[in-house]
Interface confidence: medium
């Protein structure tokens, strides 16, 4: 791990697994300020590679419900509203951190987990494989 | 707070801020494989709304390196390689959870924080505001 000078004001951990297990302040829920990021977006409808959002639920995880983007078409939507199959709608994926209850059902013990989610779609030129 | 049946195998929290402060195991379980967005796909180059990836580093945060997408053009790239300014390249934004050391430099105390990152770009039809 990273070598960090010990501050006398730091919480002390006697955990034998330290620093694998840490104390985490969950005050992400305090929306008492207006500095939180502003939600964008009806892009999912206006994009040339539009997408729908599909629900994925796991009650032992935070967030328990994750909505995943699924591209509506294989191709991309042209100005006239028709789909151009010479182009491809593809999902843009991103890793996010989630918290999983561990041991299960314990109210104050979690494991950090990385999962890959599809955030939206973009329109790309296809890779054409030429056969010799 | 929430009444959850107490499991004898659960860590006990005497913290007065419970459940605002919880124990988190950082032995991150990775449900996917690739992490570097440049390695995972070349969509950023092949998209009609291409983007560049900028490295954002902060040693007091986990993950310490986050890649941010910046759209290359205001418009979208046409089949002939020229930019169509009747369409807009826009960033697809997503919140991610990160851990921030708090107090700073403490090795085993963190705050969960939400930050907004641009993951990639998509090409959208602009919203036209008609003046009465």
């Amino acid at each position: 791990g990273i070598a960090i000078p010990r501050n006398s004001g730091c919480p002390n951990s006697e955990d034998k697994n330290f620093p694998r297990t840490v104390m985490v302040n969950l005050n992400i829920h305090n929306r008492n300020t207006s500095t939180n990021p502003k939600r964008s977006s009806d892009y999912y409808n206006r994009s040339t590679s539009p997408w729908n959002l599909h629900r994925n639920e796991d009650p032992e995880r935070y967030p328990s419900v994750i909505w995943e983007a699924k591209c509506r078409h294989l191709g991309c939507v042209k100005a006239d509203g028709n789909v151009d199959y010479h182009m491809n709608s593809v999902p843009i994926q991103q890793e996010i951190l989630v918290l999983r209850r561990e041991p299960r059902h314990c109210p104050n013990s979690f494991r950090l987990e990385k999962i890959l989610v599809s955030v939206g779609c973009t329109c790309v030129t296809p890779i054409v494989h030429h056969v010799a | 707070g929430i009444a959850i049946p107490r499991n004898s195998g659960c860590p006990n929290s005497e913290d007065k801020n419970f459940p605002r402060t919880v124990m988190v195991n950082l032995n991150i379980h990775n449900r996917n494989t690739s992490t570097n967005p440049k390695r995972s796909s070349d969509y950023y180059n092949r998209s009609t709304s291409p983007w560049n990836l900028h490295r954002n580093e902060d040693p007091e945060r986990y993950p310490s390196v986050i890649w941010e997408a910046k759209c290359r053009h205001l418009g979208c790239v046409k089949a002939d390689g020229n930019v169509d300014y009747h369409m807009n390249s826009v960033p697809i934004q997503q919140e991610i959870l990160v851990l921030r050391r708090e107090p700073r430099h403490c090795p085993n105390s963190f705050r969960l924080e939400k930050i907004l990152v641009s993951v990639g770009c998509t090409c959208v039809t602009p919203i036209v505001h008609h003046v009465a």
Partner: antibody, heavy 126, light 107 residues
């Protein structure tokens, strides 16, 4: 589809407390939060506070701080709202509402109220 | 706290007419604005979330737009069953707040 069923009407005297229950069925109880919203006769809607089930975190409107307690029992999938020090101004219909807390459209924690209980009428009169 | 101001307070409309209700926030709330319909002696019902996202099961004549401080709920072709009070709700900043309501009745 989540359904929220609230306890029956209550008549209380000034100074007393009232505790209303909100039983949830359908969907996983831990996947969402419950907020409490009240509506005085002929008036609009007023948020009192809420609980995020996954962490058991509560938030209260300043106006009700110290007078309201919101709890939940995961084993019975029931949320509760207790309001103390009642006055005639607390005469209202009290609603519980589901707050999804989803990761939706790229953001953590959605905060719309997508499902409501049928309401519990509380009358405070001496 | 963030104050939401709806206009008009009351609207009497003929069936098939278009209804527009506006909601103005006292500060920027991005798209954290939701619309509800409440009929007499009933619970509120979610119509639109996050300014413009439609809700499954809600008729397509209901639509929402706007961001920042100015938002609009539109009913395209009012039907008799749409007689109700409509509320906007912001969830950007705690406490959650609601507009004062707009009552729509049928002429």
């Amino acid at each position: 589809e989540v359904q929220l069923v609230q306890s029956g009407a209550e008549v209380k005297k000034p100074g007393e407390s009232v505790k209303i229950s909100c039983k949830a069925s359908g969907g996983s109880f831990r996947s969402y939060g419950i907020s409490w919203v009240r509506q005085a006769p002929g008036q609009g809607l007023e948020w009192m506070g809420g609980i995020t089930h996954f962490f058991g975190i509560t938030d209260y409107a300043q106006k009700f701080q110290g007078r309201v307690t919101i709890t939940a029992d995961e084993s019975t999938t029931t949320a509760y709202m207790e309001l103390s020090g009642l006055t005639s101004d607390d005469t209202a219909v009290y609603y519980c509402a589901r707050e999804p807390n989803d990761f939706w459209n790229g953001y953590y924690d959605t905060h719309d109220f997508d499902s409501w209980g049928q309401g519990t009428t509380v009358t405070v009169s001496s | 706290e963030i104050v939401l101001t709806q206009s008009p307070d009351f609207q009497s409309v003929t069936p098939k007419e278009k209804v527009t209700i506006t909601c103005r926030a006292s500060q920027n709330i991005g798209s954290e604005l939701h619309w509800y319909q409440q009929k007499p002696d009933q619970s509120p019902k979610l119509l639109i979330k996050y300014a413009s996202h439609s809700i499954s099961g809600v008729p397509s004549r209901f639509s929402g737009s706007g961001s920042g401080t100015d938002f609009t709920l539109t009913i395209n072709g009012l039907e008799a069953e749409d007689a109700a009070t409509y509320y906007c709700h912001q969830s950007d900043t705690l406490p959650h707040t609601f507009g004062q309501g707009t009552k729509v009745d049928i002429k």
